[in-house]
């Protein structure tokens, strides 16, 4: 039995006609099975295969090789969270967090907890003590005075 165009199988009861549109992106093999075009997958070949490495959790694509990030995620593979806007010396594990690096504090990690170490403000051999975020105190050697032992 010779089947009409696009019909396959015993009894010609299988249909496959190549298409490349909203409904699918496929060719047909000699048995009438859909063979997805490069970059497409799924039963109807209408699901794009995303960029290799694209986060399956935070990235997706509608075109092959693409990787579109969910809100709150960034990077080539959508695997990097976006920290809280204005976060200075902090990182995130989840979107919009601002987890401070060592010696930094405050909501935006912009408060120096180690002002002494960062700025070394005490002059003339004065001893520096961190007293709070962005705060310090200098103990001046004999003969010197002022906030930074500068006098």
């Amino acid at each position: 039995v010779t089947c009409d165009d696009y019909y396959y199988g015993f009894g010609c009861n299988k249909f496959c006609r190549p298409r490349d549109d909203f409904f699918g992106h496929y060719a047909c093999d000699q048995n009438g099975n859909k063979t997805c075009m490069e970059g497409w997958m799924g039963p109807e070949c209408n699901r794009a295969i995303c960029r290799q490495g694209c986060s399956p959790k935070h990235g997706s694509c509608k075109l092959p090789g693409d990787c579109r990030c969910q809100y709150g995620w960034q990077g080539l593979y959508c695997d990097k969270c976006i920290p809280h806007p204005g976060c200075v010396h902090g990182i995130c594990n989840e979107p919009w967090q601002c987890l401070c690096e060592t010696n930094w504090g405050g909501q935006l990690c912009d408060k120096d907890l180690n002002y002494c170490g960062t700025h070394q403000p005490c002059l003339n051999g004065g001893t520096c003590s961190n007293t709070g975020p962005d705060k310090y105190q200098c103990s001046c050697p004999e003969g010197y005075s002022g906030p930074n032992c500068e006098i």
Partner: antibody, heavy 116, light 107 residues
Framework: QVQLVQSGAELKKPGASVKVSCKVS????????IHWVRQAPGQGLEWMGI????????KYAQKFQGRVTMTVDTSTSTAYMELSSLRSEDTAVYYC?????????WGQGTLVTVSS | DIQMTQSPSSLSASVGDRVTITCRTS??????LTWYQQKPGKAPKLLIY???ILDSGVPSRFSGSGSGTDFTLTISSLQPEDFATYYC?????????FGGGTKLEIK
């Protein structure tokens, strides 16, 4: 087995909106598109649109453009069809159906009556 | 949009008769045509898809033919349960329009 179960009948006033749900079971929801078809009393079948359940992309018949919104919730395997600015001519049974090569599976239908 | 012209719109026939319903499209749809049967108060039932492939469980007295723009649904020997309304529908491109229907009644 494959099942499409629709929400119950609705009575709406002209100008209102209606949202019909279609919960599917028996197959992977995102493998098949969902279509919506309606049938006014004593009339024929009218195709309204299709939604790609994987991406959530939809395409509508020109007649319903701007008034219909089709959405999906993949977490509950449910498709939704919302029709706004209802008028008496929208009184019909609304069906969801599954398919690419014709509709082998249909919901039981939801009667939407628009009356003041 | 592709227009679907289904004829006749109604038809009276007797049990055992051979019945033919036709569907013509305004442009080439290859074999992207489906036939449905609908009984009052029920959802349509798929009979034939891709113009000539019988859906599983559909009796062999139903057959479909045609491609391009002209299609036919044939019931070789009418049975009492076949009295219903029949619709064609194309699924070539959006929108997937339906024919107007053919109401098959007992003579």
């Amino acid at each position: 087995q494959v099942q499409l179960v629709q929400s119950g009948a609705e009575l709406k006033k002209p100008g209102a909106s209606v949202k019909v749900s279609c919960k599917v079971s028996g197959y992977a929801f995102t493998d098949y598109a969902i279509h919506w078809v309606r049938q006014a009393p004593g009339q024929g079948l009218e195709w309204m649109g299709i939604i790609n359940t994987y991406y959530g992309d939809s395409k509508y018949a020109q007649k319903f453009q701007g008034r219909v919104t089709m959405t999906v919730d993949t977490s509950t395997s449910t498709a939704y069809m919302e029709l706004s600015s209802l008028r008496s001519e929208d009184t019909a049974v609304y069906y969801c159906a599954r398919g690419y090569d014709g509709f082998a599976y249909w919901g039981q239908g939801t009667l939407v009556t628009v009356s003041s | 949009d592709i227009q679907m012209t289904q004829s006749p719109s109604s038809l009276s026939a007797s049990v055992g008769d051979r019945v033919t319903i036709t569907c013509r499209t305004s442009e080439n749809i290859y074999s992207y045509l489906t036939w449905y049967q609908q009984k009052p108060g029920k959802a349509p039932k798929l009979l034939i898809y891709h113009a000539k492939i019988l859906d599983s469980g559909v009796p062999s007295r139903f057959s479909g033919s045609g491609s391009g723009t002209d299609f036919t649904l044939t019931i070789s020997s009418l049975q009492p349960e076949d009295f219903a309304t029949y619709y064609c529908q194309h699924h070539y491109d959006i929108p997937w329009t339906f024919g107007g229907g053919t109401k098959l009644e007992i003579k």
